[in-house]
């Protein structure tokens, strides 16, 4: 899947655009907003009625090297008594992000953008019931 | 620090860190995931902490369309379909990386940008602060 060109007619390609070889693009991986703080609600992963755990992977040939994934703890949801209610379902909520992959081919190194699907947490849903005729 | 695995026969010139600027292939390697959460699942309607999805569009960014979740209620939906204010609907937020055209309007020059998105909502037990 290619990155779309700027489609709006009022966008004229500025003279200041850097020269880029065909079939590739220039990517600055110094992240904009890198130091922006994230204030998440505390411990929502254990306070949720559909609680989750986190797993982490780390790959030095991926940028970012660290990717954290959520995994729902239960099939059902936790009720007011703290017990699992299997009449409801804990389901994962997912979000795409981009990563840069470094590839070694012989002695040359190339870089590839990759879309990664990250599970960010879980939510409790009413199940879809399929009636069999 | 960490050393990057490399072919032992190659000259030892490669930096263990990623360079600041790289040339990348225009094709994005991915499983063709569905970027419209409304089409991929109806969890946003079936959840006990339902949310609405708002389209955020920016032609200077890739992906240009990002869907933002906003919880519909402060409380959660109980078995009777009513809002229970003893529980809280809270957004699940995630930092993601996107591409920002830099310089602006340039077709093939980008910089990574970190943005915070609300992906959905979950129902949590509230933190109760007791006032002395």
């Amino acid at each position: 899947r290619k990155i779309p060109k700027v489609g709006h007619t009022f966008f004229q390609k500025p003279e200041s655009c850097p020269p880029v070889p065909g079939g590739s693009m220039k990517l600055d991986i110094g992240i904009i907003n890198e130091n922006q703080r994230v204030s998440m609600s505390r411990n929502i992963e254990s306070r949720s009625t559909s609680p989750w755990n986190y797993t982490v992977t780390w790959d030095p040939n991926r940028y970012p090297s660290e990717v954290v994934q959520a995994q729902c703890r239960n099939l059902g949801c936790i009720n007011a008594q703290g017990k699992e209610d299997i009449s409801m379902n804990s389901v994962p909520i997912q979000q795409e992000t981009l990563v840069v992959r470094r590839k070694h081919q012989g002695c040359s190194v190339s870089f590839q953008l990759e879309k990664v699907l990250v599970t960010v947490g879980c939510t409790c849903v009413t199940p879809v019931i399929h009636h069999v005729q | 620090g960490i050393t990057i695995p490399r072919n032992p026969g190659c000259p030892n010139s490669e930096d263990k860190n990623f360079p600041r600027t790289v040339m990348v292939n225009l094709n994005i390697h991915n499983r063709n995931t569905n970027t419209n959460p409304k089409r991929s699942s109806d969890y946003y309607n079936r959840s006990t902490s339902p949310w609405n999805l708002h389209r955020n569009e920016d032609p200077e960014r890739y992906p240009s369309v990002i869907w933002e979740a906003k919880c519909r209620h402060l409380g959660c939906i109980n078995a009777d379909g009513n809002v229970d204010y003893h529980m809280n609907s809270v957004p699940i937020q995630q930092e993601i990386l996107v591409l920002r055209r830099e310089p602006p309007h340039c077709p093939n020059s980008f910089r990574l940008e970190k943005i915070l998105v609300s992906v959905g909502c979950t129902c949590v037990t509230p933190i109760v602060h007791h006032v002395a």
């Epitope: 992240i31 890198e34 505390r42 411990n43 986190y54 | 930092e95 990386l97 970190k114």
Partner: nanobody, 119 residues
Framework: EVQLVESGGGLVQAGGSLRLSCAVS????????MGWFRQAPGKEREIVAR???????AYAEFVKGRFTVSRENTKNTVYLQMNSLNIEDTAVYYC?????????????WGQGTQVTVSS
């Protein structure tokens, strides 16, 4: 200059437990995410666990509930409690610190502590 010093490694029998500690000095400990990594002979370094500034913890798949990472901000220390150790857990264990973002690396590393699990 930020310094990380690991301790608590040693020789333990399979099925046993160890508690690793990592003391951090020279920086603002409470603002760092902390990671535990390990490197076995002839293998690449791999992440074991990480803990962010506000508590959430994440573990590598192979941990399977056997290890617990925790931090004590008042003591500038991070811990790795390792239970049900097996021979495959033999490695040098490293503690690392970095800016608390998913997209930041680990800028500071300890020298490592050897963990040997015998049968």
């Amino acid at each position: 200059e930020v310094q990380l010093v690991e301790s608590g490694g040693g020789l333990v029998q399979a099925g046993g437990s160890l508690r690793l500690s990592c003391a951090v000095s020279g920086g603002t400990f409470s603002t760092y995410k902390m990671g535990w990594f390990r490197q076995a002979p002839g293998k690449e370094r791999e992440i074991v666990a990480r803990i962010s500034t506000n508590g959430p913890t994440a573990y590598a798949e192979f941990v399977k509930g056997r290890f617990t990472v925790s931090r004590e901000n008042t003591k500038n220390t991070v811990y790795l409690q390792m239970n049900s150790l097996n021979i495959e857990d033999t490695a040098v264990y490293y503690c690392a610190a970095g800016y608390d973002s998913l997209f930041a690396g680990y800028d500071y590393w300890g020298q490592g502590t050897q963990v040997t699990v015998s049968s």
